[in-house]
Interface confidence: low
């Protein structure tokens, strides 16, 4: 399980993104989006809190200098955010890049992700 | 990286069953669903459903409630699907799928299944 | 269930042409959450689907700048700049809106 200090190092990071996840993880089978609120999943949180170091990292967002801060951002914290921070880019570096070039926000980039979990999603 | 292992093919009488297997690897098995989908030989591709490991859920197409079955198991990371009272209709290739709101889309390679006596 | 028309079903070109597909739903496919959930895949003979736009005009990583997606509500297209020769196969529509998720017949592009 992960630490309280990562959930704290991730609420810190969500001062402005507030507090249920959008992105509600599923489709109804009619194709609606599910509407009851969620707590934000943990994927969702990683993703915005990530996202968001990113965006300090670089000042103009390029492919170049997001990629180039993207071999940083998993260096910091304990070895479980370390380890969690990795696999999560592993995953979406390439979505999160193309974001982040393109001037989407954090909750852009994660919730079109949708982290929350289980994560269906389409065809 | 992740990949979506399907089983043989398998030629099989009509009236049987039939269950194929689509082994997940390089990725949380419970994190993603996966999906089905059958193509007909040069034909068009059918959704057929997806089960959700993580927490069992399972949606099918209308059309395939009672033909298909779908399953997994956790423990090898391995969703299965089950087809019954197979006929020449059901012969096609099947396909596995994980997809994450298409910025992550890996099929398997497919299972064809023939029906013939 | 929604039914994806695509026309044509086959469509010849030469290298370095343009190509265009069509893909019409019998639905409105806007999402009540705003988004269109329309997707173009390729599909080269003994292969798997692969993805090259999702939500109508995103390309998918990896896919050439040549190709571009378009289109709101019911009417739809795909676009190839210039057609090289690793783009000739069956291209598919599909819409993930509404339940059961549905694929259009396929355009196959092949050599004039």
């Known amino acids: 399980r992960l630490s309280p200090e990562y959930y704290d190092l991730a609420r810190a990071h969500l001062r402005d993104e507030e507090k249920s996840c959008p992105c509600l993880a599923q489709e109804g089978p009619q194709g609606d989006l599910l509407t009851k609120t969620q707590e934000l999943g943990a994927d969702y949180r990683t993703c915005l809190t990530i996202v968001q170091k990113l965006k300090k990292m670089v000042d103009k967002p390029t492919q170049r200098s997001v990629s180039n801060a993207a071999t940083r951002v998993c260096r910091t914290g304990r070895s479980a955010w370390r380890d969690v921070c990795r696999n999560f880019m592993r995953a979406y570096q390439s979505r999160v890049t193309q974001g982040l070039v393109a001037g989407e926000t954090a909750q852009q980039i994660c919730e079109d992700l949708r982290l929350c979990i289980p994560s269906t999603g389409p065809l | 990286q992740v990949q979506l292992q399907q089983s043989d093919a398998e030629l099989v009488k009509p009236g049987a069953s039939v269950k194929i297997s689509c082994k997940a690897s390089?990725?949380?098995?419970?994190?993603?669903?996966i999906h089905w989908v059958k193509q007909k030989p040069e034909q068009g591709l059918e959704w057929i459903g997806y089960i959700s490991p993580g927490n069992g859920d399972v949606w099918y197409n209308e059309k395939f409630k009672g033909k298909a079955t779908l399953t997994a198991d956790k423990s090898s990371s391995t969703a299965y699907m089950q087809l019954n009272s197979l006929t020449s209709e059901d012969s096609a290739v099947y396909f596995c799928?994980?997809?994450?709101?298409?910025?992550?889309?890996?099929w398997g390679a497919g299972t064809t299944v023939t029906v013939s006596s | 269930d929604i039914v994806m028309t695509q026309t044509p079903l086959s469509l010849p070109v030469s290298l370095g042409d343009q190509a265009s597909i069509s893909c019409r739903s019998s639905?409105?496919?806007?999402?009540?959450?705003?988004?269109?959930?329309l997707h173009w895949y390729l599909q080269k003979p003994g292969q798997s689907p692969k993805l090259l736009i999702y939500?109508?005009?995103n390309r998918f990583s990896g896919v050439p700048d040549r190709f571009s997606g378009s289109g709101s509500g019911t009417d739809f297209t795909l676009k190839i700049s210039r057609v090289e020769a690793e783009d000739l196969g069956v291209y598919f529509c599909s819409q993930s809106t509404h339940v059961p998720w549905t694929f259009g017949g396929g355009t196959k592009l092949e050599i004039k």
């Open positions: 639905q409105s496919l806007v999402h009540s959450n705003g988004n269109t959930y």
């Open positions: 390089g990725y949380t098995f419970t994190d993603h669903a």
């Open positions: 939500k109508v005009s």
């Open positions: 799928k994980r997809w994450n709101y298409g910025y992550f889309d890996v």
